[in-house]
């Protein structure tokens, strides 16, 4: 039959961060290979990762076509060394993935503080706008471009000499906070989509950045910048 002794895939799981999206499954293949298909609810199936011995398939190129669509994938199992034959009528065993809506479900990647600059008793903190693989008119879009106002950032800041944290929020990638003159502060940011009600509502916190701890900081302005 051409599908003898093949085992259907199971535990199909979407792993997605900032729209980079990979479908994973089990088991590790023994004498079998896999092909993945993906479609929207109303669309046609498109095959990816043909006859692969891997247990993952990068579907980013497909889901970024419309991140607000809902996608379904399925994984077919074939005997190792399988060559597609026109005469084969028996459908190989397959398993469906859970539905996946990238806009609602992709995890927010760990943000990065791009720069901070102190002028007097104010500090301007800028969050780096991460690029995604989502395109519009052949241009890659940033996380802000895709999510717009659905994405906010929370800034946590505290005096280097104490542990009491303060917070600020912004609908942009910029903060402007009041600080005490002569004090050094530390900063960390977190990306948040408030409209989400699930575990993927928040990113992990960014690495902590502190005033006065880095090379390249100007004593006059307290300017500090990362180049990526």
């Amino acid at each position: 039959s051409g599908t003898t002794n093949t085992v259907a895939a199971y535990n199909l799981t979407w792993k997605s961060t900032n729209f980079k999206t990979i479908l994973e499954w089990e088991p590790k293949p023994i004498n079998q290979v896999y092909t993945v298909q993906i479609s929207t609810k109303s669309g046609d199936w498109k095959s990816k990762c043909f006859y692969t011995a891997d247990t993952e398939c990068d579907l980013t190129d497909e889901i970024v076509k419309d991140v607000k669509q809902t996608y379904l994938a399925r994984v077919f199992s074939y005997p190792a060394g399988h060559v597609e034959s026109t005469g084969s009528t028996e459908e190989p065993p397959y398993e469906n993935s859970p539905e996946f809506t990238p806009y609602l479900e992709t995890n927010l990647g760990q943000p990065t503080i791009q720069s901070f600059e102190q002028v007097g008793t104010k500090v301007n903190v800028t969050v780096q706008d991460e690029w995604t693989l989502v395109r519009r008119n052949d241009t890659f879009l940033s996380l802000r471009d895709v999510f717009g106002k659905d994405l906010i950032y929370t800034l946590y800041y505290w005096k280097s000499s104490s542990s009491g944290k303060k917070t600020a929020k912004t609908n942009t990638n910029e903060f402007l906070i009041d600080v005490d003159k002569g004090e050094n502060y530390c900063f960390s940011v977190q990306a948040v989509i408030p409209s989400r009600r699930t575990a993927n509502r928040k990113s992990t916190d960014s690495p902590v950045e502190c005033m006065g701890h880095e090379k390249g900081e100007s004593r006059e302005t307290g300017h500090h910048h990362h180049h990526h």
Partner: antibody, heavy 125, light 108 residues
């Protein structure tokens, strides 16, 4: 100084699609603001229809979402509203507005600070 | 959706008097997302107050905003003839963004 001007037909037949364009002058549509449509039924309050970012990211009022499309044309410095399957209940003054960031409480938040003059759209056969 | 209820519906006052307008939300609104607009007949709304208590550029200091949570207030300390208009509160923290029904401040 940014100015907005709505344009489009003042009369639309029931079941047809209402199409309006807002032209932005005195500034770039790609400069980090959002662009909104709001309407006001005769003698009534204001109803938010939706908004768009220059990147094409949109938010819509769920009550109108199935009928509304907002799009942006950065090359013409314009954004547009399409409202399908209109009825007499869609008769209103339609405003376009800029949603610009203002500093508040350590961060920046968006408020509709520049509005067009509004255009009256009547739905009637 | 968040419903904003404004009261009173109409406020009849004389120039020089103090006007106090109320806006009550059906659920808590982050102050950062609360604004007040003024609209005169035949004109588009004009932003007066943002962040519940900050005056927009060019707005006279007789206008002030206050409040948090579900209760917000717009106060006009001394009414000038040009202040007679309809005032709307608005929230844009939660989709759909919503406006209150408006309070008309008219000359007594």
């Amino acid at each position: 100084q940014v100015q907005l001007q709505e344009s489009g037909p003042g009369l639309v037949k029931p079941s047809q699609t209402l199409s309006l364009t807002c032209t932005v002058s005195g500034g770039s549509i790609s400069s980090g603001q959002y662009w909104s449509w709001i309407r006001q039924h005769p003698g009534k309050g204001l109803e938010w229809i939706g908004e768009i970012y220059y990147s094409g990211s949109t938010r819509y009022n769920p009550s109108l979402k199935s009928r509304v499309t907002i799009s942006v044309d950065t090359s013409k410095n314009q954004f547009s509203l399409k409202l399908s399957s209109v009825t007499a209940a869609d008769t209103a003054v339609y405003y376009c507005a800029r949603d610009a960031p203002y500093y508040y409480g350590g961060g920046y938040y968006y408020y509709m600070d520049v509005w067009g003059k509004g255009t009256t759209v009547t739905v009637s056969s | 959706e968040i419903v904003l209820t404004q009261s009173p519906g109409t406020l009849s006052l004389s120039p020089g008097e103090r006007a106090t307008l109320s806006c009550r939300a059906s659920e808590s609104v982050d102050s950062s997302y609360l604004a007040w607009y003024q609209q005169k007949p035949g004109q588009a709304p004009r932003l007066l107050i943002y962040g519940a208590d900050s005056r927009a550029t060019g707005i006279p200091d007789r206008f002030s905003g206050s409040g948090s949570g579900t209760d917000f207030t717009l106060t006009i300390s001394r009414l000038e003839p040009e202040d007679f208009a309809v005032y709307y509160c608005q929230q844009d923290g939660v989709v759909p963004y919503t406006f209150g029904g408006g309070t008309k401040v008219e000359i007594k």
